[in-house]
């Protein structure tokens, strides 16, 4: 699987999950989140050659089409597969509230 | 929705479904499909700016991050959302067989 275990410990050139830290204030302009100040969101990057973790029958067809037509702009793209929530603390007035923000952290990628 | 109805009748620059015809023999090297000779597979293409048909909370965060960090390589990607099957005819010797190949045609796209 193109997950953090594999991708973070390899020098994989093809589609894989990459490390990305997002600072809520600096990178998103969000002032309402009190904790954490930022988080390891990660992102997906890398080419999707034929056979590389293809998501559907269509992805296989498109990757194969791309192999036969290397100049074509039609190609599968490396996108998130498994996403995890992020627990955050924000304030309503002086009262702290804990919330789970769903689908915030990329754990693995796929070619779609 | 970024579907064929909208995308094929517009000059949309952002993520949208685009027309692509695939010839089974020429583009994939498949000799075993008798009918059709090819099909309109379509593909997804175009940038994914903030708010543009974003798939998950993560996609929104990444698009916003990209807006704050325009030079970053981390950005959402335009990928298939709705896929449809394709009925095909292949031969087992002289005997024709009909099969549905699932997830073969792109009907709409999303930013993931």
């Amino acid at each position: 699987a193109l997950d953090t275990n594999y991708c973070f410990s390899s020098t994989e050139k093809n589609c894989c999950v990459r490390q990305l830290y997002i600072d809520f204030r600096k990178d998103l302009g969000w002032k309402w989140i009190h904790e954490p100040k930022g988080y390891h969101a990660n992102f997906c990057l890398g080419p999707c050659p034929y056979i590389w973790s293809l998501d559907t029958q269509y992805s296989k067809v498109l990757a194969l089409y791309n192999q036969h037509n290397p100049g074509a702009s039609a190609a599968p793209c490396c996108v998130p597969q498994a996403l995890e929530p992020l627990p955050i603390v924000y304030y309503v007035g002086r009262k702290p509230k804990v919330e789970q923000l769903s689908n915030m952290i990329v754990r693995s990628c796929k070619c779609s | 929705a970024l579907d064929t109805n909208y995308c094929f009748s517009s000059t949309e620059k952002n993520c949208c479904v685009r027309q692509l015809y695939i010839d089974f023999r020429k583009d994939l090297g498949w000799k075993w499909i008798h009918e059709p000779k090819g099909y309109h597979a379509n593909f997804c293409l175009g940038p994914c700016p903030y708010i543009w048909s974003l798939d998950t909370q993560y996609s929104k965060v990444l698009a916003l991050y990209n807006q704050h960090n325009p030079g970053a390589s981390a950005a959402p990607c335009c990928v298939p959302q709705a896929l449809e099957p394709l009925p095909i005819v292949y031969y087992v010797g002289r005997k024709p067989k009909v099969e549905q190949l699932s997830n073969m045609i792109v009907r709409s796209c999303k930013c993931s």
């Epitope: - | 498949w30 075993w32 292949y90 005997k95």
Partner: antibody, heavy 120, light 108 residues
Framework: QVQLVQSGAEVKKPGSSVKVSCKAS????????ISWVRQAPGQGLEWMGG????????NYAQRFKGRVTITADESTSTTYMELSSLRSEDTAVYYC?????????????WGQGTLVTVSS | ETVLTQSPGTLSLSPGERATLSCRAS???????LAWYQQKPGQAPRLLIY???SRAPGIPDRFSGSGSGTDFTLTISRLEPEDFAVYYC?????????FGQGTRLEIK
Amino acid sequence: QVQLVQSGAEVKKPGSSVKVSCKASGYTFSSDVISWVRQAPGQGLEWMGGVIPIVDIANYAQRFKGRVTITADESTSTTYMELSSLRSEDTAVYYCASTLGLVLDAMDYWGQGTLVTVSS
Amino acid sequence: ETVLTQSPGTLSLSPGERATLSCRASQSLGSSYLAWYQQKPGQAPRLLIYGASSRAPGIPDRFSGSGSGTDFTLTISRLEPEDFAVYYCQQYADSPITFGQGTRLEIK
């Protein structure tokens, strides 16, 4: 160049199953159809079935239906043939072969063969 | 299923001679659903002819195939020492694919 490399010889007990692998290299596996053929010692050739790896459509000889399963793993360009409820008459060399492109077709490239011996 | 009968069972000839191998089908195969293979001891079969008369890549032109319907022939115009082997015909018109029982071509 095109190569089909099969797994090693197997000795099996009657009633058990065997799974033989066939790894393709040197060409686009995705455009292929793979057939499996066996040859009992000193005997002729017998077709068991075939698979279209990219869509996992398999076709079997009637006499093996229910006992043979042919599958493909595209990520490793490998095809598998599993034969269950083995009996002594299944002792044979098992070959994988790529066809000229159709489900039933002539077979242009062959694996080296895998000897399966069924004995108690 | 389609039964293929090869004749003769064994053919004894000398290098330089012409070999004619026959394959008869129990039902018509049309004109393009027959192949011929050569097999040597301990080796996998090697495709010689497909579509009844088309030579496979790399096969010398001394090998030729002919026939249609139920009667097919493999001809080796001038036998070379490496041609002595077992030859099989195969039909792929109908499932299951079937093979003939083989013709052994031996040195006289």
